[in-house]
Interface confidence: medium
């Protein structure tokens, strides 16, 4: 099945290409799949078909749905599907995962970030670029055609980059934004078997019944950008999310890069209102990457009342 996911924000332009390709001379008909209603080709409509392209000028949340395109030639018909989702604009800076285009990697030698889908639009330079919602300023950043070049790339340049441009259609202008993550490959980086700094193996953590307790799992993985590195907690060998105890939650700590350049991660396990049965559980701090997995086990013990006096 030739299907393609497309997404956009309300009140922005969105242009979708039919997943089935054909010669420019072939006609392409578009339909809204749920009603089988034909999409008009007249440009006065807010949503209209233009050959292989389906244009939302601008898009509305109600436009979300599956659109069918049929490429017709004298000898065959090819059918494709465009699964379109239009989202409300976020009030905060955070760009959710479902609005992100594919992640790109860069290094000191190669740091181009292409603006996703821009080739579908009628736009003119310059592009505007933002990182984590902040407009990029400074001589290190150069907007060049449809991509951004970053000079002297550093680890700190990793993040979410948004390109913003104007699509012009018959004299009318529409805004478009697209966001993708940029990760930095450290040319001098290396990875090693995870090293758990805390907790110690078979550590006994004293807790008070009825009070809150925090356990921190901290591990280092090497230097520079790390593939598939993670720290997480398990309860009796089960993922926290699968264990089903709402009092016990894990929360990602701060990404760390120590002065020696090691890449480290924290995961904090928060236990609210500690109960007797929590003392019976086995708490595993897991650190894993491409070299394998290391596990440190922690058990809880009731704080001796005599400790209150010391």
């Amino acid at each position: 099945k030739f299907s393609k996911q497309s997404w956009g924000l309300e009140n922005e332009a969105l242009i979708v290409r039919c997943p089935r390709q054909g010669k420019p001379s072939y006609t392409v008909d578009w339909y809204y799949s749920q009603t089988n209603k034909s999409i008009p080709t007249q440009e006065r409509n807010r949503v209209f078909a233009s050959g292989q392209l389906l244009k939302f000028l601008p898009a509305a949340v109600a436009d979300s749905g599956i659109y069918t395109c049929i490429v017709r030639s004298p000898t065959f018909n090819r059918t494709g599907y465009a699964n379109v989702t239009i989202y409300k604009k976020q009030s905060d800076c955070n760009v959710p995962d479902y609005l992100m285009y594919s992640t790109v990697s860069g290094s000191e030698k190669n740091s181009k970030i292409y603006c996703p889908t821009i080739d579908l639009y009628n736009w003119t330079a310059p592009l505007e670029w933002f990182k984590n919602c902040q407009a990029l300023q400074g001589s290190r950043y150069r907007a060049h055609k449809s991509f951004l070049v970053i000079d002297n790339v550093m680890t700190e340049d990793a993040g979410d980059y948004t390109c913003k441009f104007i699509h012009n259609e018959n004299g009318a202008n529409y805004s478009v934004t697209a966001t993708r993550s940029f990760t930095v490959k450290d040319e001098q980086g290396f990875s090693l078997f995870p090293v758990i700094g805390a907790p110690a193996q078979n550590e006994i953590k004293e807790v008070e019944i009825g009070k809150n307790a925090n356990l921190t799992c901290s591990a280092c993985f090497g230097k520079g950008t790390q593939f598939l590195a993670a720290v997480l907690w398990q309860l009796n060998g089960t993922k926290i999310t699968d264990f089903g105890e709402p009092r016990i939650q894990q929360e990602e700590g701060q990404n760390q890069s120590f002065s020696n350049g090691l890449a480290c991660l924290d995961m904090v396990l928060r236990i609210a209102d500690v109960k007797e049965e929590d003392l019976l559980l086995q708490y595993d701090c897991l650190a894993l990457n491409l070299h394998g997995l290391r596990r440190h086990t922690v058990r809880l013990s009731r704080k001796n009342p005599i400790d209150h006096h010391s």
Epitope: D97, S102, T103, T183, A229, A230
Partner: nanobody, 120 residues
Framework: EVQLVESGGGLVQPGGSLRLSCAAS????????MGWFRQAPGKEREAVAS????????YYADSVKGRFTISADNSKNTAYLQMNSLKPEDTAVYYC?????????????WGQGTLVTVSS
């Protein structure tokens, strides 16, 4: 949260082949990396192979180099592990994993696993 579903496991004779698939749904597939881990009975989970879905660079554990091949199809949101010349010591539950990097806010997830048994 990204959901991962593995398939393709089963019983195979030594020297045989299997192809494992890992389909991702519910999130952005083109995160930084996908990989396969395995866990044999009574042993710790170990890394087998991984691939950067954004750049295509791969990693293999020494024990599977030359026999296993990892690949990813971004258009299908799926990663594959082609396993050739299988040995009895490859018997394990194979888990698919997806994750970002330390400098990327995406979460690490793994699937429920698919059992591979190599036996005559």
């Amino acid at each position: 949260e990204v959901q991962l579903v593995e398939s393709g496991g089963g019983l195979v004779q030594p020297g045989g082949s299997l192809r494992l698939s890992c389909a991702a749904s519910g999130g952005t597939f083109s995160v930084y990396a996908m990989g396969w881990f395995r866990q044999a009975p009574g042993k710790e989970r170990e890394a087998v192979a991984s691939i950067s879905t954004s750049g295509g660079s791969t990693y293999y554990a020494d024990s599977v180099k030359g026999r296993f091949t990892i690949s990813a199809d971004n258009s299908k949101n799926t990663a594959y592990l082609q396993m050739n010349s299988l040995k009895p010591e490859d018997t394990a539950v194979y888990y698919c994993a997806i994750g970002g990097t330390l400098y990327d806010r995406r979460r690490f997830e793994w699937g429920q696993g698919t059992l591979v048994t190599v036996s005559s």
